[in-house]
Structure formats: structure tokens, C-alpha cells
């Protein structure tokens, strides 16, 4: 007779990351009897929802249900039917919805209301949709990467089970770049966090952490580009904007109404004598870098030191995981290797931006032109943000690790969010630790 496998005693959780440019659904799985162990939760699926971010549905809220269908149906397939009713579903919306809320609380609520009604139609245990704060986004990203790196585990190992592990309990800082905001989160070294808004206290697995975090709204890569265009068109002599952040030969028409649609460009808004203008790429890294630096106000700092725009930033400490768009952009540019110095990254960006647009299109024929056209800007922006914004140096660059996944789970805020909401990170170290996969018997 054939042995029947015992049914796995596992649990599942679903988190939807409703970002400014798109929504992704993540499915997590963990052994039911090891809920309080560190590192046992892992991602089993990521489903990218086709279409833009939910904030773009403000004029067509009736389409939200259809928009979410494919990924929710995928979740239905991946998670065993017997587990559906006890699988929690959370949706967290980030900076795209924060911006919409700044424009209109009513419109933001209307979008979330339809999202909630749509998600309630599935057989899972829907726990609500909300706009998370920038502070939460930073904190949960920090929890995610340190949880996956095993930094909260009190077991010392003579071997490494995860990449980047330095075999100590020193946590990694988290650098997250989205379309509409960017977050920096880390434990400073014996430094008072001078601004209370940027201070977080955690007790995780019996250890206290004093964490610095800040989310820069409007400094995600997409909104930063809108800001730069709005700033530069102010001084353009006509409806042609010669832009160093786009490849030579690149041309694109932009509607002024689209440029001023976002609250991020309000500070640059002016009455222009034209309704449209044309971007003409000239592909010059150095000039692009200079233009981007004008978005960072470094002239004012009410603290001992600042990042930019008068925001306190303690001295950088330890290693950092840079994920989300930091990783996607650098991966595309083939600049994620630990061996590539900051000087080399800059050199490669200079070469990349100077390449003619026709040549770029041929070399990357499979990439959508909308995305392809913006890698020169995005790569330059990442360098500007990390070096001039956050004060990384050529020396400390080696402490930045561009991370897509850790142990098969995406780096990002969603895992930390779920761990927190399902109470899976205990404040105290569990008394007895069951044998885990990293223990030899």
C-alpha cells in the first residue's frame, strides 16, 4: 500500500501592495506550529495586477473589481480551498494614494471603499484596505529585510543561510524607492534621533531597537521626474525642453495639464504660454545630475545634520539593503554587483545616458519604450539621492546591497506588514525554540 502524506499544517496570508504605479499581490506561507519563530514565513507567489496604481481609477471606480480579479483568482488557485476562510487579506496603499488624499480625501476614500467592496467578495478573511503612513512603509520594509536576513534570530550560526549575512546581529538599514516616495530606515549608532517624527522604538524577540525612519513624499522616481520637468520648463524659452536625462534623439510631447496634475509639482507651477511642450533628449549624465540636485534643498537644516528639505538624518551606520525600484533600475542597468564601485557606476551611467535613443531601442527591443526611456533619469536619480540626498560616499557605497529577493521572498514592506498584523513577531524571545531547518540533529 502507498503511504499517504499527512496534510501540511500550514497557514497562508495575502498582502496587496497598492503602489503609485501598480498593485502587486503577495502570498505568504508558514508552518502553523512555528508562528513565533523568526524566518519561517516565506513568499510563495507574487502576482502583478495588470494596469496602473489604484489612485488612477478615481474617474472609473467601477473598473476596480475587474482590475483585481486575475490576481485574486490566482490566490484562490494557489491557496488550498480548505484554507480560504482563515487566510487573512490586507491591502496597504502607499504614496500614490497619499497624494490623492492630499488632493481630495473624498476621492481617496471613494477608491478605497470600492477596493474594500471588491475584496470582500472573495472567500478569504478580508481585513481591510487602508493608506499606510510613510513611517509604516519604512518600518515594515526594515522589519521585512531583517526578518528574512535572520537578524532577529538569537541563534548564532557558524554557517550562512542567507546572502549578505555578516554573521552578526547588527541589523541592515532599509532603502526603499517607489514611484511616488522613498524611505530610509536604519538603527543609528548611539545617536539621539533629534526629530521625534523620525524615531521608532521596537521590542522584537526580546531586543530593543531605536530606529530612524523617514519617507520623502514626492521623491519616488516617477514623481521626482515630474518635479524635475516642472522645474526645468519654468526656464525654457519656448515649448521645447532640451533634457539631459533622456537619450540623444529621444522626443516626447507632454501636456502641461498632466505636469501640474500632481501635488508634487505645485511648488513649480506657473502659467505657461503653451499647453504642450516637447522633451528633446540630449543625454548628458553630468547635466542631468545637476538638474536633479536642484530638487534637494540643502540650504536649510534645523538639526545637527539633514538629508535634504530640512529633514533630520543621523550619520549612516552599517549595511543597507536597497530594494524595490532601487533594485529594479540597477538590475536593468546591470549595476547590482557588490563588486561595482560607485565610481564605476557613475562611469557606466555616463555611457548609458549618452547612447542614442535609436541604439537603445535596438539593444533593448523587448522593453516597453515608456520604461526604457526613463532608465537614464532613474539611474541618475538613484545616484543623486544616495550620494547627495542621503550622504553615502564612494567608500560607504560598498555597504549598499541592491536586493530583489531574500530567500525567495521579495524585499519590501508587505511581509513586515503582515507579520505585524498577524502578531507573528513577538516582543519577547519565545521560551523554547522548536528544531528549525537551520539546526542539525
Amino acid at each position: 500500500t502507498q503511504n499517504k502524506a499527512l496534510p501540511e499544517n500550514v497557514k497562508y496570508g495575502i498582502v496587496l501592495d497598492a503602489g503609485s504605479s501598480h498593485t502587486s499581490l503577495y502570498i505568504y506561507k508558514w508552518p502553523a506550529e512555528k508562528e513565533n519563530d523568526t524566518g519561517v514565513v516565506h513568499q510563495v507567489e507574487e502576482c502583478r495586477v495588470k494596469g496602473p496604481g489604484i489612485s488612477k481609477f478615481v474617474q472609473k471606480v467601477n473598473e476596480i473589481g475587474i482590475y483585481l480579479t486575475d490576481c485574486m483568482e490566482r490566490a484562490r488557485e494557489v491557496i488550498p480551498r480548505s484554507q480560504h476562510q482563515e487566510t487573512p487579506v490586507y491591502l496597504g496603499a502607499t504614496a500614490g494614494m497619499r497624494l490623492l488624499r492630499m488632493e481630495s480625501e473624498e476621492l481617496a476614500d471613494r477608491v478605497l471603499d470600492v477596493v474594500e467592496r471588491s475584496l470582500s467578495n472573495y472567500p478569504f478573511d478580508f481585513q481591510g484596505a487602508r493608506i499606510i503612513t510613510g513611517q509604516e512603509e519604512g518600518a515594515y520594509g526594515w522589519i521585512t529585510i531583517n526578518y528574512l536576513l535572520g537578524k532577529f534570530s538569537q541563534k548564532t550560526r557558524w554557517f550562512s543561510i542567507v546572502p549578505y549575512e555578516t554573521n552578526n546581529q547588527e541589523t541592515f538599514g532599509a532603502l526603499d524607492l517607489g514611484g511616488a516616495s522613498t524611505q530610509v530606515t536604519f538603527v543609528p549608532q548611539n545617536q539621539t534621533i533629534e526629530s521625534p517624527d523620525n524615531a521608532l522604538q521596537f521590542r522584537l524577540y526580546g531586543k530593543d531597537y531605536n530606529v530612524y525612519t523617514h519617507s520623502f513624499l514626492c521623491y519616488g522616481k516617477d514623481q521626482a521626474l515630474w518635479q524635475k520637468l516642472a522645474k526645468d520648463i519654468q526656464v525654457a524659452s519656448n515649448e521645447i525642453l532640451r533634457d539631459p536625462c533622456f537619450h540623444p534623439g529621444y522626443k516626447k510631447v507632454v501636456n502641461v495639464s498632466d505636469l501640474y496634475k500632481t501635488p508634487c509639482t505645485k511648488r513649480f507651477e506657473m502659467t505657461l504660454p503653451f499647453q504642450q511642450f516637447e522633451i528633446q533628449g540630449i543625454g548628458n549624465y553630468q547635466q542631468c545630475h545637476q538638474s536633479i540636485l536642484e530638487l534637494f534643498n540643502t540650504s536649510y537644516c534645523p538639526y545637527s545634520q539633514c538629508a535634504f528639505n530640512g529633514i533630520f538624518l543621523p550619520p549612516l551606520q552599517g549595511d543597507f539593503g536597497a530594494f524595490s525600484a532601487f533594485y529594479f533600475v540597477m538590475k536593468f542597468l546591470n549595476l547590482t554587483s557588490e563588486k561595482v564601485s560607485q565610481e564605476k557606476v557613475t562611469e557606466m551611467m555616463k555611457k548609458f545616458c549618452a547612447q542614442p535613443w535609436e541604439e537603445i531601442k535596438t539593444s533593448y527591443a523587448g522593453v516597453k519604450e515608456k520604461y526604457l526611456s526613463e532608465y537614464c533619469f532613474s539611474g541618475t536619480y538613484i545616484l543623486s539621492l544616495l550620494l547627495q540626498g542621503y550622504h553615502f560616499t564612494a567608500d560607504s557605497w560598498e555597504h549598499i546591497h541592491f536586493i530583489g529577493k531574500i530567500q525567495g521572498s521579495d524585499a519590501g514592506w508587505t511581509l513586515g506588514y503582515m507579520l505585524n498584523l498577524t502578531n507573528m513577531i513577538p516582543a519577547e524571545q519565545p521560551l523554547s525554540t522548536p528544531l528549525s531547518h537551520s539546526t542539525y540533529v
Epitope: 478615481v58 474617474q59 488624499r101 492630499m102 488632493e103 481630495s104 480625501e105 473624498e106 476614500d109 501635488p263
Partner: antibody, heavy 117, light 110 residues
């Protein structure tokens, strides 16, 4: 069934202060926008301000500084604190759930504030 | 400051006839369509009739309709009934969580 009821209106002297309450039931304050609107006797509707689901507040330019909106979600109540009251502040004060989309039963009946010496 | 100008101030229309009320905003409303119309009867709070410039609130008779975009909007009562006697207000929603009511239009039977 959702319901909003204003209270706290009455007679106040010029220069005085008053706090109006808006008690809500049938829905969660933590997920709702509440607005305050007033109407002077025989006059039109005038927007005062709103408090968002996250607690953010926004005001009409004329109301900034003198009027403050707050809420206590545990008591299901939103407040309108009014200071330096003048004769022209005499009106019926309404609270509403939302504003542009304030559907059926989304408005309270109103509370009258009289400013007089 | 944003100014919402509503016209006429008052309107007398025969039963069964069409009534038209206009609202003009000093700046474009959010998304060009964030405009609502309210009906208010004496001693009552306002009642929502139309939102998104042209969407009829549920339970509102279809003789009420709204049109317009950007800065110019119209409320039409296609066939005035006795119960439609009231004051009508437009309300615009603007970028930055700003709002402005029109001055109101009193509708009476001729």
C-alpha cells in the same frame, strides 16, 4: 442605519467660544470623512471644513485660525471648536458624512448657534 | 479665494415646465467633474441630488439631470413638480480638499 446628530449650540456672547459635537452611529469614524457646513438665517450654505479618516483637517480660508475640527473615534464624535465668535457666525451648523457624495441620511439636522450680547 | 457663482437667484416655473440652474466656478473643479447639486427645503438639511456633475444619486427622480465640465455646470429639472419647490445649491470640490458652495437658487411655481 447611519445617523449624525449635532449638539452644543446655543447662545454665546460676542468674543466667546463654543464647542459643537457631532455624534455619529451606523458607520465607523475611523474610515469616514466628516464635514461641517453652516447656514446663517435666510442665507445660503457655507463650507467650514472637513476632518479626514486619518484625522487630517482642512478648512475654508475664512475659518482658519478661529475654527478647529477634531474627533474622538472611541466616542464616535467629531467636534467643531469655535473661537472669537461674532454676530455673523450666528447660523445653523450642520455636520455631514462626506460632502460631494453625502448621500441619503448623511446630514445631521443641525444645531443653532446664536451670537448676541 | 474660489468663487462659485450660481444663477439665477430665483426662478418661477410653471408645473410640468423645464427649470434650468447654472453654476460657474472661478477655477476648474477637481477632475473637471467634482461638482454636486443639493436640494434644501425649509427646516431640513440639504439633500444630495447629483454628484460627479451628472450622476444621479439613487432614489432621486430622473427628471433631475446635471451637465457640464471644468468651470460651467447646469442642473435641469425637465418637468417641474410641486414637491420640487426648494432652494438648490451647487458645490464644487477643488484640489487640496477645498470646497465652495454656490449662493443658491430658489425655485418656485409660477
Amino acid at each position: 442605519e447611519q445617523q449624525l446628530v449635532e449638539s452644543g449650540g446655543g447662545l454665546v456672547q460676542p468674543g466667546g467660544s463654543l464647542r459643537l459635537s457631532c455624534a455619529v452611529s451606523g458607520f465607523s469614524l475611523s474610515k469616514s470623512i466628516i464635514s461641517w457646513v453652516r447656514q446663517a438665517p435666510g442665507k445660503g450654505l457655507e463650507y467650514i471644513g472637513i476632518i479626514g479618516s486619518s484625522g487630517s483637517t482642512y478648512y475654508a480660508n475664512w475659518a482658519k485660525g478661529r475654527f478647529t475640527i477634531s474627533k474622538d473615534s472611541s466616542k464616535n464624535t467629531v467636534y467643531l471648536q469655535m473661537g472669537s465668535l461674532r454676530a455673523e457666525d450666528m447660523a445653523v451648523y450642520f455636520c455631514a458624512r462626506g460632502l460631494l457624495y453625502s448621500g441619503n441620511k448623511s446630514w445631521g439636522p443641525g444645531t443653532l448657534v446664536t451670537v448676541s450680547s | 479665494d474660489i468663487v462659485m457663482t450660481q444663477s439665477p437667484d430665483s426662478l418661477a416655473v410653471s408645473l410640468g415646465e423645464r427649470a434650468t440652474i447654472n453654476c460657474q466656478s472661478s477655477q476648474s473643479v477637481l477632475l473637471n467633474n467634482q461638482l454636486s447639486w443639493f436640494q434644501q427645503k425649509p427646516g431640513q438639511p440639504p439633500k444630495l441630488l447629483i454628484y460627479d456633475a451628472s450622476t444621479l444619486e439613487s432614489g432621486v427622480p430622473d427628471r433631475f439631470s446635471g451637465s457640464g465640465s471644468g468651470t460651467d455646470f447646469t442642473l435641469t429639472i425637465s418637468s417641474l413638480q410641486a414637491e420640487d419647490v426648494a432652494v438648490y445649491y451647487c458645490l464644487g470640490g477643488y484640489s487640496g480638499n477645498l470646497y465652495a458652495f454656490g449662493g443658491g437658487t430658489k425655485v418656485e411655481i409660477k
